[in-house]
């Protein structure tokens, strides 16, 4: 049941074209730009999605460039390669030779270089900062009410396990939500915290990524909880190499 | 891998009364644990719920207030309610999730009987 | 998210077959699991995501279903089969009233 047999349509990613040639003739649905295979009961990879709204037709694409400032992923949209699992290829490149080394989450993590540049393994961002400013309320919201919401909100809208949701912090109208996933603890079928972090991002831009579900409705106690900025920190197993020119 | 409740009693109306669930054989930190409670005769009823990690606690909309779900050791989740009446008097269960992101419970308890009457 | 189960209860010989169903309220996306419980014994978990079967579970117990509408389909129906089948939405914990179904009864004639 990897998609809705009804309407044959992917519940998780609207980025998909689904039809009934499955085996058995079950809907089946695979990633624009890509062609992959999708698995529709859970979070298609970042990599396939990044490569979908980079096929995307200009005038057609419903979804709009990060502001410069929004993101620490500075580089902000490029074609990725994807490999067969649709992770990202450890090294990547542009159309004109340059390349560059990315983490698990596709975020640049050298110098760029040409082609003779190595990156010997993909490595794993291991702990995701997302950091929200909310719009302005009557009151603060109740620490430990918000903690709870966004705990669930993770776990039934993009099915990552508590267990990964490290911490929830909250002075307002900051809230950091700290997401962890070293390498042993990610079992089979549990949803990358990378993957987890940039549906989320999505949702909050209300770009979401999901078919035929509303957009994200973030209550707590009642009262809307809505973001008007995000950054998102990332930190992997191996540290960075950059030099030191890119640090002053 | 094993749950059971303890505690459960005969107790008169608007007693309080604490049910605690004990594991073994597992990591709780790795589940969700959940209360359900069954009237006598009567279909299952969910209470509430609690994150292990993170300790997060959910109730069903009529438990709200009157019922708290706590992790009080490595191996134990407590039940305590309040205010209670006839209406109470249920077989209580404490179940685990089976460590999906779904709330399928795959281990239960044998269940405690609790009995308010005057 | 309410639960609908119905029948409450069904009679069927033995090597028949039941069919019960169950009715969400919402949407759950086939987080749906249905359990069996015998008399004086806790629930136990016969299917999960409205038709993967649990563990050691006999293949005559067939789910399925998506969106709103669920069945649980019991073929050759057995004597062990006799007891009460719920239905229960896996899909958010989030301002519920209760995530089963009313239940229903198999007797087995």
């Known amino acids: 049941h990897t998609a809705a047999q009804d309407n044959c349509t992917c519940p998780t990613n609207k980025m998909t074209v689904c039809s009934p040639d499955g085996p058995g003739g079950r809907c089946q649905c695979r990633a624009l730009g890509s062609g992959v295979a999708v698995d529709c009961s859970t979070l298609t990879s970042k990599c396939l999605l990044l490569k979908a709204r980079m096929s995307a037709p200009k005038n057609a694409r419903t979804l709009v460039r990060p502001n410069e400032h929004a993101l620490v992923d500075n580089d902000g949209l490029y074609d990725p390669d994807c490999d067969p699992e649709g992770r990202f290829k450890a090294r990547q490149c542009n159309q004109t030779s340059v390349c560059w080394c990315v983490n698990s989450v596709g975020v640049r993590r050298t110098d760029k270089g040409d082609l003779s540049l190595r990156c010997d393994e993909l490595v794993r961002t291991h702990h995701i900062l997302i950091d929200l400013r909310h719009r302005p309320t009557a009151s603060a919201f109740n620490h430990s009410d918000l903690d709870a919401e966004l705990r669930r909100l993770f776990r039934e809208r993009y099915r990552l396990h508590p267990k990964f949701v490290a911490a929830v912090h909250y002075e307002q109208p900051t809230i950091q939500i700290e997401l962890r996933q070293n390498t042993s603890q990610k079992a089979a079928g549990d949803v990358d915290i990378g993957d987890a972090a940039y549906y989320f991002e999505r949702d909050v831009k209300g770009e979401s990524l999901f078919q035929g579900r509303g957009g994200l409705d973030l209550r707590v106690r009642g009262e809307p909880l809505q973001v008007e900025r995000t950054l998102i920190y990332y930190l992997d197993e191996i540290p960075p190499k950059f030099s030191m020119k890119r640090l002053t | 891998q094993s749950l059971e409740e303890s505690g459960g009693d005969l107790v008169q109306p608007g007693a309080s009364l604490t049910l605690t669930c004990k594991a073994a054989g597992f990591d709780l930190n790795n589940y969700s644990m959940l209360w359900v409670r069954q009237a006598p005769g009567k279909g299952l009823e969910w209470i509430g719920c609690i994150y292990i990690s993170g300790g997060t606690t959910y109730y069903a909309s009529w438990a709200k207030g009157r019922f708290t779900i706590s992790k009080t050791s490595s191996t134990t989740v407590t039940l305590q309610m309040t205010s209670l009446t006839a209406a109470d008097t249920a077989t209580y269960f404490c179940?685990?999730?089976?460590?999906?992101?779904?709330?399928?419970?795959?281990?239960w308890g044998p269940g405690t009987l609790v009995t308010v009457s005057s | 998210y309410d639960m609908t189960q119905t029948p409450a209860s069904v009679s069927e010989p033995v090597g028949g077959t039941v069919t019960i169903k169950c009715q969400a309220s919402?949407?759950?996306?086939?987080?749906l699991a249905w359990y069996q419980q015998k008399p004086g014994q806790p629930p136990k978990l016969l299917i999960y995501?409205?038709?993967d079967l649990a563990s050691g579970v006999p293949s005559r117990f067939k789910g399925s279903g998506s969106g709103t509408e669920y069945t649980l389909t019991i073929s050759g129906l057995q004597c062990a089969d006799a007891a009460t089948y719920y239905c229960q939405q896996g899909y958010t914990i989030g301002n519920i009233d209760n995530s089963f179904g009313g239940g229903t009864e198999v007797v087995v004639k």
């Open positions: 919402e949407d759950i996306y086939r987080l």
């Open positions: 179940a685990r999730d089976d460590g999906s992101t779904s709330y399928y419970l795959n281990l």
């Open positions: 995501d409205a038709s």
